[in-house]
């Protein structure tokens, strides 16, 4: 009955040697796909000469191959009842699911502009940067390949810094040959409501980015929870994207290839403002661009990027305050399309398919010595691009899992 | 308070160097950059270059490349300025100075100077 | 680079009257101009800074005004301990330039 049903699962989803869990956990059976919406400024010299609201138009989607590399450094340790791993990073382009190519060109925000003018407010260095920006002739916005924009293109103004600095920039840079973590996570051995849940990240229990409780990280990777989810559940994961834990709650009961499956998604609650969601208080860190911590919708997580203004939202900045993109012109929000999701089989508590949205922004202010920011008026968080990360169990592997697990229990 | 104390007044040969100081007190020294000026006498000022006193990050006038290096001690809080291959136009009055960042305030604390004096 | 000219190069007053210097920029620097007054064997001492922003500790008889390429520093009535050279210096652009001086005197 349900009893042996129960012991087979608490079994099967242990993160050790053997088990369907972890020859699916090491090395994802599922196609994961990352696409890209660029968004292409429309009026350069208007924003830069006026400061008028910024006419974006967004093109995409560019698709990546992403995920596809086996963990590294897998190590259990079976003193703790943990696993540590290392998970690589590679991203193969597929045209054939893109629009385009990445020889695409885009109008986008100068980011090295935008950040060195940010991280260095000492208006003599200003000076020295104006120098270098004129010198090098970079501008508020500048025209870059899809894979300089992604993936790095050495910049020219940061080129001429007779200093070592990294002199090439990228919204994603680096990125191949790199692995994220080292994550340490609890293989459920000797308690299975811990499996997949993070003991460690880089060593540590705690991020540093940001106080109190934000700085705490929760849950699992997303990837797979504890077996026996409730629709009752806050499901609770890190992101190492976003610099930040976060949670999803039940939306609804969904029928995945004839899985039931269970639809949970990123509430709009959390990305509220504390005065909304008290909770959120640390997670706002200046008082200037959060209007005293009213506006919402947008994360600074500059200090989790080496000080550069990186804001990151939902897609279109849905759920985000007006005044936030109110200087924007050409964004369209939709739940349906901009939210996230994960579609949890709720026995194994594997997630069967996901849609992970964010978009990544860049604040960029006036500034009186920088030549090319001179005549802004007001800040800008200014959106780059959007992303729609997605991944959906096999059919092959969908029938297996009917037969193996879902058949089973009905 | 804050105090820029500059070394004493110095006689050089042409074509030889010098190298002076400024020892910063009554304040944390890599907080800020120091600034020299030069004013040859009874003439106007001219602005050298600054260093960053944090990372030793050097800016200079166009008209001092080559001729004024400037470089600091951390450990003793003291800025040193050193001039090459000196000619009468280097006979001046040179001063380290320091500024209030942030504010938009240039030169705002400046040293007593240190006269060099270029004579055979 | 920005030129600054300066004028006029010298004047004399008699105590208690007014005193205008002048200073044009040959690129708009906006209001990023500051006043400096050097007394015989001391250094500058900063007057006045960016934004027309008198120091703290300096009298109110000293001013400034001007935008763009056309600034004047201003002394109203002027007295003995004022005698001194003026600088102008412009902290817009790369290399920052001073004026050539002004060189007050009392008649």
């Known amino acids: 009955g349900d009893l042996l049903i129960q012991k087979t699962i608490k079994k099967q989803v242990v993160l050790e040697e053997g088990t369907i869990a972890f020859k699916n956990w090491v090395k994802t059976g599922t196609e994961v796909y990352r696409q890209f919406w660029i968004f292409d400024v429309q009026n350069p010299q208007e924003v830069m000469m006026n400061s008028s609201n910024i006419q974006v138009k967004q093109r995409g989607p560019y698709t990546y191959r992403v995920r596809f590399l086996a963990k590294e450094n897998v190590t259990q340790d079976a003193e703790d009842n943990t696993v540590s791993f290392l998970q690589p990073n590679g991203a193969i382009f597929e045209p054939s699911l893109s629009v385009g190519t990445e020889a695409d060109n885009f109008t986008v925000l100068n980011l090295a502009v935008a950040a060195a003018s940010h991280i260095y407010q000492n208006q003599f260095v200003q000076m020295i940067l104006n120098s270098l920006i004129n010198k090098s002739k970079s501008s508020m916005f500048q025209v870059r390949t899809l894979r300089e924009l992604l993936w790095g293109y050495r910049d020219p103004f940061l080129s001429l810094v007779p200093y070592p600095v990294t002199t090439t920039v990228g919204l994603f840079y680096p990125y191949n040959n790199t692995a994220d973590g080292v994550y340490k996570v609890f293989n459920g051995k000797d308690n299975i409501s811990k499996v997949a849940i993070i003991d460690t990240y880089k060593g540590k229990r705690n991020l540093s980015y940001w106080e109190s409780h934000c700085d705490m990280i929760n849950g699992t990777d997303a990837a797979s929870f504890p077996p026996f989810v409730e629709k009752s559940q806050v499901l609770q994961f890190f992101s190492s994207d976003i610099c930040r834990s976060i949670y999803a709650v039940f939306e609804s009961d969904v029928n995945l290839k004839g899985i039931p499956v269970y639809r949970f998604v990123l509430p709009s609650k959390a990305f509220a403002s504390p005065v909304e969601n008290p909770d959120n208080y640390c997670f706002c860190t200046e008082k200037i661009i959060s209007k005293n911590c009213t506006s919402y919708g947008v994360l600074d997580i500059s200090k989790c990027k080496e000080g550069r203004p990186v804001y990151i939202s939902l897609p279109h900045f849905l759920y985000a305050s007006p005044d936030v993109s109110e200087p924007i012109d050409g964004l369209n929000p939709n739940e349906e399309e901009h939210r996230t999701y994960l579609d949890i089989e709720p026995i194994t508590g594997f997630t069967l398919q996901f849609a992970k949205r964010l978009q990544v922004n860049l604040l960029v202010k006036p500034s009186e010595k920088i030549q090319v920011l001179k005549n802004l008026k007001r800040n800008y968080i200014v959106p780059i691009l959007w992303l729609n990360e997605t991944g959906t169990i096999g059919d092959e592997k969908a029938n297996m899992f009917r037969s193996q697990v879902t058949g089973k229990i009905n | 308070q804050v105090q820029l104390q500059q070394s004493g007044a110095e006689l050089v040969m042409p074509g030889a160097s010098v190298k002076m100081s400024c020892k910063a007190s009554?304040?944390?020294?890599?907080?800020?950059?120091m600034h020299w000026v030069k004013q040859r006498p009874g003439q106007g000022l001219e602005w050298i270059g600054s260093?960053?006193?944090?990372?030793?990050?050097?800016t200079y006038s166009q008209k001092f490349k080559g001729k004024a290096t400037l470089t600091v001690d951390e450990s003793s809080s003291t800025a040193y300025m050193e001039l090459a291959r000196l000619t009468s136009e280097d006979s001046a009055i040179y001063y380290c100075v320091r500024g209030e960042d942030y504010e938009g305030t240039w030169f705002a604390y400046w040293g007593q100077g240190t006269l060099v004096t270029v004579s055979a | 680079e920005t030129t600054v000219t300066q004028s006029p190069a010298s004047l004399s007053v008699a105590t208690g009257e007014k005193v205008t210097i002048r200073c044009i920029t040959s690129t708009d620097i906006d209001d990023d101009m500051n006043w400096y007054q050097q007394k015989p064997g001391e250094p500058p001492k900063l007057l006045i800074s960016?934004?027309?922003t008198l120091r703290p500790g300096v009298p109110s008889r000293f001013s400034s005004s001007g935008y763009g390429t056309d600034f004047v520093f201003t002394i109203e009535n002027t007295l003995s301990e004022d005698v001194a050279d003026y600088y102008c210096?412009?902290?817009?652009?790369?290399?920052?330039?001073f004026g050539a001086g002004t060189k007050l005197e009392l008649k």
């Open positions: 960016e934004g027309n």
């Open positions: 210096l412009q902290s817009d652009n790369m290399p920052l330039t």
């Open positions: 260093i960053d006193t944090s990372d030793s990050y050097t």
């Open positions: 009554g304040y944390t020294f890599t907080d800020y950059w």
